[in-house]
């Protein structure tokens, strides 16, 4: 008989936890130093040895007396049936094609877990098993009583299983949903008796690879590669997981100490592709996700250091900085960013090698900037580095507007009282700090003769007594690097308030809306005048320049309010920077109706007549222009008299209205009373808006006819 | 018969550490879930920890989480509570029970009493 | 955390009288709500499991209902030896929470 080359010595061995026969023998026939290609027929039955359920051919390669090791994992729980194990070999070697024949079987190996449960009345399994959603699972009860009837239930539902044996119940859970973070609840009881058994099958959320996997350089010595791990399990108790680093080309693995990202040593033997593979890996499954990349396609330089802004000037700055080499013959593109009041207003590109260098020019003086730099690889371009950002002041520079001039000229006792005022440079015409503000007075009657002033900022105006001169002012703004242009003004002896017809103007939402007719002679501008609190002895005098073929402008103030009336003088500015008054407007941004009514004094009081008569009151202090006057005349007639019309009063009486629309008249005769009889009179002013407020009504009674004989 | 007693109650200032244990038997120790309840004196019942059958899923109360650590002997059929850096508020009685269903209560030891005071 | 809130706090009650205890808890608990029974002195007990399922060895008398987060314990006719404080529980959602009690008196 040929020889046999069976399989001996079989021994297996179980693992609960993972559901796993573990099977181990060798084949002892062999001679020495020999090796054979062999294939293992190895059969599993489950309860009675007829009935096989798993039939597996397993190939490998045998040396003599060398342990084979073998594993299955079986869907049903070890625990809930009895399983047996055999096994016959065969040489599937060419060197030996006489040999290609089946071995004997070993004897059935047998592996009943259930004698060893212990002697409770039920048990459940598996035990704490753990699973990916959507799997497919088995469990089982194993009962040591026949007589009672068991139930058993998945999260409360009743299941529906298939009996294995008298003592054996097997259900068939299909695509397992993840229901909480500490598992899903089975569990069977007896019908009879104190017992309950239940078990938790931990069901995780699908493992998911790994994403946005992705390796960088900043130095070309170490890669640092980064990834975002999938979802976590959904389990209070999570599961560990590895995640693994493998390079084709090098052969290295290394195993990352972190869950996102890991680093890479570069080969210093300039190695320049990588292929790299991720692996992430749980108690349930591996993920792989794979990248190959040029490493000098990966720079990330690091941000530029040493940046200094150098020789800032009024208008000019430099900015230098060094970059960090990222090898012998690249090339860095670095982006400069120039930053004024939070805006960027300037951008560059500029190419280094080692040492960036860019000029900043047309700024503005005395100005914050902030001025950043970044870099990239020029050859191939991955990613900005950081910005390194450097904060500078441009120089001052002298001032570049005249201030803007305007004067008060008032006659007190045979003097000029000029008040000068000036407005405060913007922040782009004062080009640093105003210190101090220059005023010099030029006699132009003594042309020689000159008087400095000097006013120290913040201050806007100054007050000057000058005789009966004419005078030419001349105003500049001075910082630490030199003088404005000068700003001229003329007073001549005649104060030029000559009377001018006062126009009325309606303001609207926009402002005032005024208008001037043209100038014959030269003028070499004209000023809009008014106060923004009128009636406040500090007024707030407020100007407007405007240039000589200008006729119109809109006036407009925040500081306008409803029912204040605005006076607005119009001058024109003669070529000798003299200013004389061209017009006069008045208004109101918003009218509003009367705030009060005028004293009504009564005279002339007859049979059939009397005479009312009211004081003129300031027109200045009324929130809106008066129109006309309202009369009210209460009496007992059922009819109105001629010349009035009935009217509803506020609470609703009946009365009579006289309408008196001349603003101007300031006496009114009511006619045709009748003797002997009550009447009751009222006053009020009305504007555009409406009438005053409703005041008390005034009691006469008109004599009998007869009463004077 | 299904039988649960604990011990290790006693006295301890705060600050001060205790290892409570539960001795089971009357049943398979190893197939079932454990938990600690502890109920201080004239109140309510609190779930404090639980164990897995095998060990390896452990959860505790939020209170307790960081200075109590529940385990477990299969072999010696024994549940343990160690509670470090005990507080006033952590004097009740400590209760072992079997756990057939998650979270569900099913058999009580009859409970040692920690008094936690300086 | 789950708050599990009990009504009554105490009740008394005659011997035979049909006795009824509400627990809302504070959000869905997919029935997994569990009733104890303590009486002065005692070990608690398990009376109810998964909202309605009996525990062995507990009368007939004692059931449960409810689904979602409003669930009833009652008692169809009290006896002298049920004078206790009840719990209920949630077992679906950690931390697991208790109710915190409703005694429960024989006049």
């Known amino acids: 008989e040929p020889l046999s080359l069976a399989p001996e010595s079989l021994e297996v061995s179980i693992d609960s936890a993972r559901q796993c026969l573990h099977l181990k023998w060798s084949v002892h026939n062999l001679a020495y130093h020999q090796e054979l290609k062999m294939v293992f027929q190895i059969e599993i039955s489950r309860i009675k040895t007829s009935n096989v359920i798993w039939v597996e051919n397993y190939s490998t390669t045998v040396k003599r007396n060398q342990v084979l090791r073998w594993s299955w994992e079986s869907k049903l729980p070890l625990e809930c049936a009895k399983h047996s194990v055999r096994m016959r070999g065969a040489v599937d070697d060419a060197q030996v094609p006489e040999l290609r024949f089946w071995s004997n079987w070993t004897s059935w190996e047998e592996v009943d877990v259930q004698s060893s449960l212990g002697h409770d009345p039920l048990f459940v399994f598996p035990k704490d098993k753990l699973v990916e959603e959507g799997s497919n699972v088995t469990i089982c009860y194993v009962s040591r009583s026949h007589q009672n009837n068991i139930s058993c239930y998945l999260e409360g539902v009743r299941m529906h299983g298939e009996q294995l044996d008298p003592n054996v119940c097997v259900f068939h859970l299909k695509n397992v949903p993840f229901i909480r973070e500490t598992g899903t609840n089975i569990y069977c009881k007896a019908d009879q008796g104190d017992v309950i058994k239940g078990i938790v099958l931990f069901v995780s959320k699908v493992f998911e690879e790994p994403k946005d996997f992705s390796c960088e350089t900043r130095d070309l010595k170490t890669l640092n590669c980064t990834w975002a791990p999938g979802s976590d399990a959904g389990l209070l108790t999570q599961l560990s997981q590895s995640y693994t680093l493998f390079e084709s080309f090098s052969g290295k693995k290394t195993l990352c100490k972190y869950k996102s990202w890991c680093n890479w040593q570069v080969s210093p033997d300039s190695q320049e592709m990588y292929n790299f593979t991720l692996t992430a890996e749980n108690y349930l499954r591996k993920r792989s996700v794979h990248l190959l990349f040029n490493l000098t396609h990966r720079v990330h330089p690091m941000a530029p250091f040493n940046v200094f802004v150098k020789n800032v000037s009024a208008t000019n700055a430099t900015m230098t900085w060094k970059v960090h080499s990222i090898g012998n013959y690249s090339t860095l593109l670095c982006q400069i960013e120039l930053y004024g009041e939070g805006k960027v207003i300037q951008k560059q590109n500029v190419s280094v090698k080692v040492n960036g260098k860019h000029l900043m020019k047309k700024l503005e003086p005395s100005t914050e900037y902030a001025a950043q730099v970044r870099c990239a690889n020029a050859n191939h371009f991955w990613k900005w580095s950081e910005w390194t950002r450097r904060n500078f002041t441009t120089a001052e520079a002298a001032p570049s507007e005249a201030p803007d001039v305007w004067r008060n000229v008032k006659s007190v006792q045979g003097h000029c009282v000029v008040t000068l005022f000036w407005k405060p440079l913007s922040k782009l015409q004062a080009n640093g700090k105003i210190l101090f503000y220059n005023v010099v007075l030029e006699n132009l009657d003594r042309p020689s003769t000159l008087k400095l002033l000097s006013i120290p900022a913040p201050a806007n105006g100054t007050e000057l007594t000058l005789d009966r001169c004419s005078y030419q002012i001349h105003v500049t703004a001075n910082n630490s690097v030199g003088t404005s242009p000068a700003s001229v003004i003329a007073v001549s002896g005649d104060p030029g308030n000559k009377e001018v017809e006062e126009e009325r103007v309606k303001g609207t939402e926009d402002g005032f809306c005024l208008s001037w007719k043209p100038q014959p002679g030269d003028v070499t501008g004209y000023v809009v005048e008014w106060c923004e609190r009128p009636g406040d002895p500090l007024c707030d005098l407020q100007w407007k320049n405007l240039g000589p073929n200008t006729t119109s402008t809109v006036v407009s103030s925040d500081a306008f309010r409803p029912g204040v009336r605005y006076n607005f003088r119009i001058y024109g500015i003669s070529t000798e920077r003299i200013p004389y008054l061209l017009e006069k407007k008045t208004g109101y941004s918003q009218e509003l109706v009367p705030s009060d009514n005028p004293q009504v004094l009564m005279s002339n009081l007859t049979s059939y007549s009397f005479t009312l008569s009211w004081k003129d009151y300031a027109a200045e202090s009324q929130p809106g222009f008066v129109q006309g006057y309202s009369l009210y005349l209460k009496s007992k007639a059922a009819r109105c008299l001629p010349g009035s019309e009935k009217a509803v009063l506020s609470d609703d009486s009946i009365c009579c209205k006289y309408k008196i629309d001349n603003p101007k008249q300031k006496t009114f005769v009511v006619e045709n009373l009748q003797p002997a009889s009550f009447y009751e009179f009222f006053l009020t002013p009305y504007t555009s808006v409406g009438e005053g407020p409703q005041g008390a009504f005034t009691k006469v009674t008109t004599p009998d006819e007869y009463s004077h004989i | 018969d299904v039988q649960l007693v604990e011990s290790g109650g006693d006295l301890v200032k705060p600050g001060g550490s205790l290892r409570l244990t539960c001795v089971a038997s009357?049943?398979?120790?190893?197939?079932?879930?454990m938990s600690w309840v502890r109920q201080a004196p004239g109140k309510g019942l609190q779930w404090v920890a639980y164990?897995?059958?095998?060990?390896?899923?452990?959860y505790y109360a939020d209170t307790v989480k960081g200075r109590f650590t529940i385990s477990r002997d299969n072999a010696k059929n024994t549940l343990y509570l160690q509670m470090n850096s005990l507080k006033t508020e952590d004097t009740a009685t400590y209760y072992c029970v079997r756990d057939p269903i998650t979270g569900t209560f099913a058999y009580w030891g009859q409970g040692t009493l920690v008094t936690v005071s300086s | 955390e789950i708050q599990m809130t009990q009504s009554p706090s105490s009740l008394s009650a005659s011997p035979g009288d049909r006795v009824t205890i509400t627990c809302r808890a504070s959000q869905d608990i997919n029935n997994y709500l569990n009733w104890y029974q303590q009486k002065p002195g005692k070990v608690p007990k398990l009376l109810i499991y998964y909202t309605s399922t009996l525990h062995s060895g507990v009368p007939s008398r004692f059931s449960g209902s409810g689904s979602g987060t409003d669930f009833t314990l009652t008692i169809s006719s009290l006896e002298p030896e049920d004078a206790a404080t009840y719990y209920c529980q949630q077992g679906n959602t950690l931390p697991w929470t208790f109710g915190q009690g409703t005694k429960v008196e024989i006049k």
């Open positions: 164990i897995s059958s095998g060990g390896d899923y452990i």
């Open positions: 009357g049943f398979t120790y190893s197939s079932y879930a």
